[in-house]
């Protein structure tokens, strides 16, 4: 369960994080599982442990194997396993599937390619980027922090992208490369001023005192991937989290749906055990993006009990 695959190339740096997390103050011990031999912490060793990180500087094919990390918390010793495979460098340009990180998709509006695992390393900009082994040149390509931005993405931009950077450890430099596939979604996206589908403006929602009630704020923002779009609820002009009523909560995370090709978001407001005072509040459904903000207001009213008398 707490196991993670890691891979790298011989003569490159490889840094692996323990699959078990912990507070920075927790001691982490590393072992080579096959021999149960402790991994040293002294940095003079080619392979050494540094807290939650296991460092191969540089890696060798013989380092392949399963490594055990034990995070010593105040209560339990929590165990994780890192399955490490170090491959020989390929002489040709092809990057085999087993060296590939997860595929990312982009479109004309959104074309960021993040360099995988880079956050584990001590590196300095700029990154070098390659596509199918060719160094990327031209004004369309911008290496920004830990990612590559491609302007005016075209279907021909799909392919395997490799980032290359230098890891520095105590003054010594080690090369690292990482490759992932990039696919282009063929979509003519656009964004427009938010359109709130629900609730209707100044809607009156009937609720029963003592029961639970759900209000859904649903809005569409355009077609395709939206750079910035959000829907949220406010109570009397205050964010739900700041309002401080634990019975009233926004659903964690925004549900994304594509209605007739449109990019839409919805956020559910859950009111537990509806009380009289909830009827006095103003409920605002807010939808915002780069074009601006739209607000629809809802009020609650008491649902009259059904009259069973004839």
């Amino acid at each position: 369960k707490f196991s993670k695959q890691s891979w790298g190339l011989e003569n490159e740096a490889l840094i692996v994080r323990c699959p078990r997390q912990g507070k920075p103050s927790y001691t982490v011990d590393w072992y080579y599982s096959q021999t149960n031999k402790s991994i040293p912490t002294q940095e003079r060793n080619r392979v050494f442990a540094s807290g939650q990180l296991l460092k191969f500087l540089p890696a060798a094919v013989a380092d392949s194997g399963i490594y055990t990390c034990i995070v010593r918390s105040p209560t339990f010793n929590r165990t994780g396993y890192a399955n490490v495979t170090i491959y020989k460098k390929q002489s040709d340009c092809n990057v085999p599937d087993y060296l590939m990180y997860s595929t990312v998709s982009g479109s004309e509006k959104n074309s960021k390619i993040y360099c995988p695992t880079i956050d584990l390393y001590n590196w300095t900009a700029p990154l070098e980027w390659f596509k199918n082994c060719q160094a990327l040149q031209g004004s369309r390509y911008r290496a920004h922090k830990s990612f590559l931005v491609i302007d005016n993405v075209m279907t021909e931009d799909a392919g395997d992208y490799t980032c290359k950077f230098i890891h520095n450890e105590n003054g010594a430099n080690y090369s690292v490369t990482a490759t992932r596939s990039f696919t282009v979604k063929d979509e003519q996206g656009f964004s427009l001023f938010p359109v709130i589908g629900a609730p209707a403006q100044n809607e009156i929602k009937e609720v029963e005192i003592g029961k639970n009630a759900n209000l859904t704020c649903s809005a569409c923002f355009g077609k395709g991937t939206q750079f910035l779009a959000a829907v949220l609820w406010q109570l009397n002009g205050t964010k739900i989290t700041d309002f401080g009523e634990p019975r009233i909560q926004q659903e964690e995370g925004q549900n994304q749906s594509f209605s007739n090709g449109l990019a839409c978001l919805d956020m559910v407001l859950r009111i537990a055990d509806v009380k009289e005072e909830d009827l006095l509040l103003q409920y605002d459904c807010l939808a915002l993006n780069l074009h601006g903000l739209r607000r629809h207001t809802v009020r609650l009213s008491r649902k009259n009990p059904i009259d069973h008398h004839s």
Partner: antibody, heavy 121, light 106 residues
């Protein structure tokens, strides 16, 4: 959503044992250690110990070590706390509780509703 | 075991006032957690890792401190804030709680 539902109130005689259950739902039971905390009437909170449901490993507060047994049934996602040789000072509300994110020990974010155990002759 | 001492034992304040609760530790700890408890209810996590606000907790609650002295502050008391507050350490076993501070209406 995460829920910890405990068994009902118990009345026991001194010297007897009590076994309180805590049924977990809304998350993967074996991914989180479960803790037991008690509170005597009008008193503060006291940590009794914890169990890792995946392995069955336990860590007990030394104060209770001789009398407490914590177990977990993976098939029903239920944890149990048994306290033996009961005495009147064991009268308390017993809570099961869980951290928000296990590996970071970031406080008890989820609590059972509590089980009142009364020890009286 | 690590002993946590909370002061004052009782704090009498009016709504709108600022509340400052202290937790003193017998030996240095890295983090402190804070809970609120109302009569007949289970405790509720307010602040974790000394200063981080737990989910759904209003911003008027804040935590600070390091080493052996930690503080919970309620910037402006609301009627629902009158309760008992506990600090708790997770630095070493056994995990321990402070004796509690009761915040009552003046």
């Amino acid at each position: 959503q995460v829920q910890l539902v405990q068994s009902g109130a118990e009345v026991k005689k001194p010297g007897a044992s009590v076994k309180v259950s805590c049924k977990a739902s809304g998350y993967t039971f074996t991914d989180y250690e479960l803790h037991w905390v008690r509170q005597a009437p009008g008193q503060g909170l006291e940590w009794m110990g914890t169990i890792d449901p995946e392995t069955g490993d336990t860590v007990y507060n030394q104060k209770f070590k001789a009398r407490v047994t914590m177990t977990a049934d993976k098939s029903t996602s239920t944890a149990y706390m048994e306290l033996s040789s009961l005495r009147s000072e064991d009268t308390a509300v017993y809570y099961c509780t869980r951290a928000f994110y296990n590996d970071y020990d970031d406080g008890f974010a989820y609590w059972g509703q509590g089980t009142l155990v009364t020890v009286s002759s | 075991e690590i002993v946590l001492t909370q002061s004052p034992a009782t704090l009498s304040l009016s709504p709108g006032e600022r509340a400052t609760l202290s937790c003193s530790v017998s030996s240095s700890v890295s983090y402190m957690h804070w809970y609120q408890q109302k009569p007949g209810q289970a405790p509720r996590l307010l602040i974790y890792d000394t200063s981080k606000l737990a989910s759904g907790i209003p911003a008027r609650f804040s935590g600070s401190g390091s080493g052996t002295d930690f503080t919970l502050t309620i910037s402006s008391l609301e009627p629902e804030d009158f309760a008992v507050y506990y600090c708790q350490q997770w630095n070493s076993s056994p995990l321990t709680f402070g004796g509690g501070t009761k915040v009552e209406i003046k």
